[in-house]
């Protein structure tokens, strides 16, 4: 029997055993976040899954993932949004640390689909474990891409208070216009809700003392912020690892010195 | 086995100040959500309050918010329903429950009866 | 607020099958668990039913739970005269940042 036809993407397919990783994580998150306790994983899991199979993986809509968006009634207390741009790893760190403060990936939907990659096809309820759009070469209203435009948006639509991210100071852009912190966050902040975006730029060499926060990619950041009538302050964190340790261990004396 | 006894209950004037407590016993008190619930007269069930274990957080009905506070003293076994600003329509049987790792109310008192009339 | 749909009141002959339908929407039944109760005239309410369709022990198989969408059933079968109470579905409701009950549905064995 010859396999049926399959459209070929120029990225990497679904990641292996999709359903079941989602689903396990949605009940790890409810049993590890008490206050979620009534969450309905398998509902859960239907919403998702509803927004991308049967669907042509080119052609992915923000009101697709409505009907799950509508589950993120998660609230973020003030002061406690931690956005990031191309410095994941750090941002979570960093909230695995200070639990009182959260990424998108500390809340569930962004919990659920961290690292992950999936897409179904056109009028068949598989999920295509072969290849999926590729934003670039491909298209970029594809599943993985649209969601994480859909929650991003969301998430900074309910941020309050002072709002943090976190950029990367390594980069030739610090702040990237073309990020989803650049295109979406940036724009979804609500300055009625929103004082004052801080902005920390992590540096990467541990001799550099250059004060990143003149950077020009941060100057356009500022205007772009201060437009919307929102406040702007800019942090240099020159040593990530001692950042984090401060974090850990305030009391520490060579924390004192702020 | 586990057992929720309320009090507190009894007749108070429109305007006026009650305090219902809840002795728990038979289980883990500090580890649990514990609720309160009430039916009104010739009603059906209505979620009033929930508290969370830890770091307490509180949640309220929006026909009670702003006039009732749910608290607990998990060294005292006890939950408590201090409740202001009485109206009428408050008047019922109140529930303390405990709630299982779903959500569920797995646990109920007898009810101690509430009546608010001039 | 707006609580769960329950018909007010479900009836039938001893050791017949009684459904008793809830119905609400994508906020409270839609993404979270629903809960069934048991509540006879002056005696606190009972746990039948949780996470959809979960019994807990000493309640008897002859109560069972289901979840499709917005809305869920509870279903009696072998109906008995114990069985004469009102039912009462609850589940968080996402909207209100609490729980809602159903308006309960007396159940009558004839």
């Known amino acids: 029997v010859l396999p049926r036809w399959r459209q070929q993407w120029s990225g990497s397919g679904t990641t292996s055993r999709f359903p079941e990783t989602v689903l396990a994580r949605c009940v790890k998150y409810t049993e590890v976040h008490p206050e979620m306790r009534h969450v309905d994983c398998q509902s859960v899991w239907d919403a998702f899954k509803g927004a991308f199979i049967s669907k042509y993986p080119c052609n992915i809509t923000e009101e697709d993932y409505q009907p799950l968006v509508k589950l993120g009634t998660q609230t973020v207390p003030c002061n406690k949004t931690l956005l990031w741009s191309r410095i994941k790893d750090l941002a979570h760190q960093f909230t695995q640390v200070q639990r009182d403060m959260f990424t998108l990936e500390d809340m569930l939907l962004g919990y659920l689909a961290d690292d992950l990659t999936w897409c179904g096809e056109f009028n068949t309820f598989e999920i295509n474990y072969q290849s999926c759009p590729d934003w670039r070469k491909d298209c970029s209203n594809n599943p993985v891409s649209v969601f994480w435009k859909t929650v991003s948006r969301r998430f900074a639509e309910t941020a309050c208070g002072v709002v943090h991210v976190m950029l990367n100071g390594s980069r030739s852009k610090i702040f990237d216009k073309n990020s989803t912190f650049g295109s979406v966050e940036v724009h979804n902040l609500q300055p009625e809700k929103v004082q004052a975006l801080e902005a920390w730029v992590i540096h990467g060499g541990r001799e550099d003392s250059r004060d990143l926060c003149q950077d020009p990619t941060i100057k356009e950041l500022e205007s772009i912020i201060s437009k919307r009538n929102i406040r702007f302050f800019c942090k240099n964190i020159y040593r990530p690892d001692k950042f984090l340790q401060c974090v850990k261990n305030p009391e520490d004396s060579s924390c004192l010195s702020g | 086995q586990v057992q929720l006894v309320e009090s507190g209950g009894g007749l108070v004037k429109p305007g006026g100040s009650l305090r219902l407590s809840c002795a728990a016993s038979?289980?883990?008190?500090?580890?649990?959500?514990m609720s309160w619930i009430r039916q009104a007269p010739g009603k059906g069930l209505e979620w009033v309050a929930s508290?969370?274990?830890?770091?307490?957080?509180?949640y309220y009905a929006d026909s009670v918010r702003g006039r009732f506070t749910i608290s607990r003293d998990n060294a005292k076994n006890s939950l408590y329903l201090q409740m202001n600003s009485l109206r009428a329509e408050d008047t019922a049987v109140y529930y303390c429950?405990?709630?299982?790792?779903?959500?569920?109310?797995?646990?109920w008192g007898q009810g101690t009866l509430v009546t608010v009339s001039s | 607020q707006a609580g769960l749909t329950q018909p007010p009141s479900a009836s039938g002959t001893s050791g017949q099958r009684v459904t008793i339908s809830c119905s609400g929407s994508?906020?409270?039944?839609?993404?979270?668990?629903v809960y069934w109760y048991q509540h006879l005239p002056g005696t606190a309410p009972k746990l039948l039913i949780y996470k959809n369709n979960q019994r807990p022990s000493g309640v008897p198989d002859r109560f069972s739970g289901s979840k499709s969408g917005n809305s869920a059933s509870l279903a009696i079968s072998g109906l008995r005269s114990e069985d004469e109470a009102d039912y009462y579905c609850?589940?968080?409701?996402?909207?209100?940042?609490?729980?809602?009950f159903g308006s309960g549905t007396k159940v009558t064995v004839l």
């Open positions: 609850a589940a968080w409701d996402d909207s209100l940042s609490g729980y809602v």
């Open positions: 508290v969370s274990n830890g770091r307490p957080t509180t």
């Open positions: 038979g289980f883990t008190f500090s580890d649990d959500y």
């Open positions: 429950a405990r709630e299982g790792w779903s959500g569920e109310f797995t646990d």
């Open positions: 994508s906020s409270n039944i839609g993404f979270h668990f």
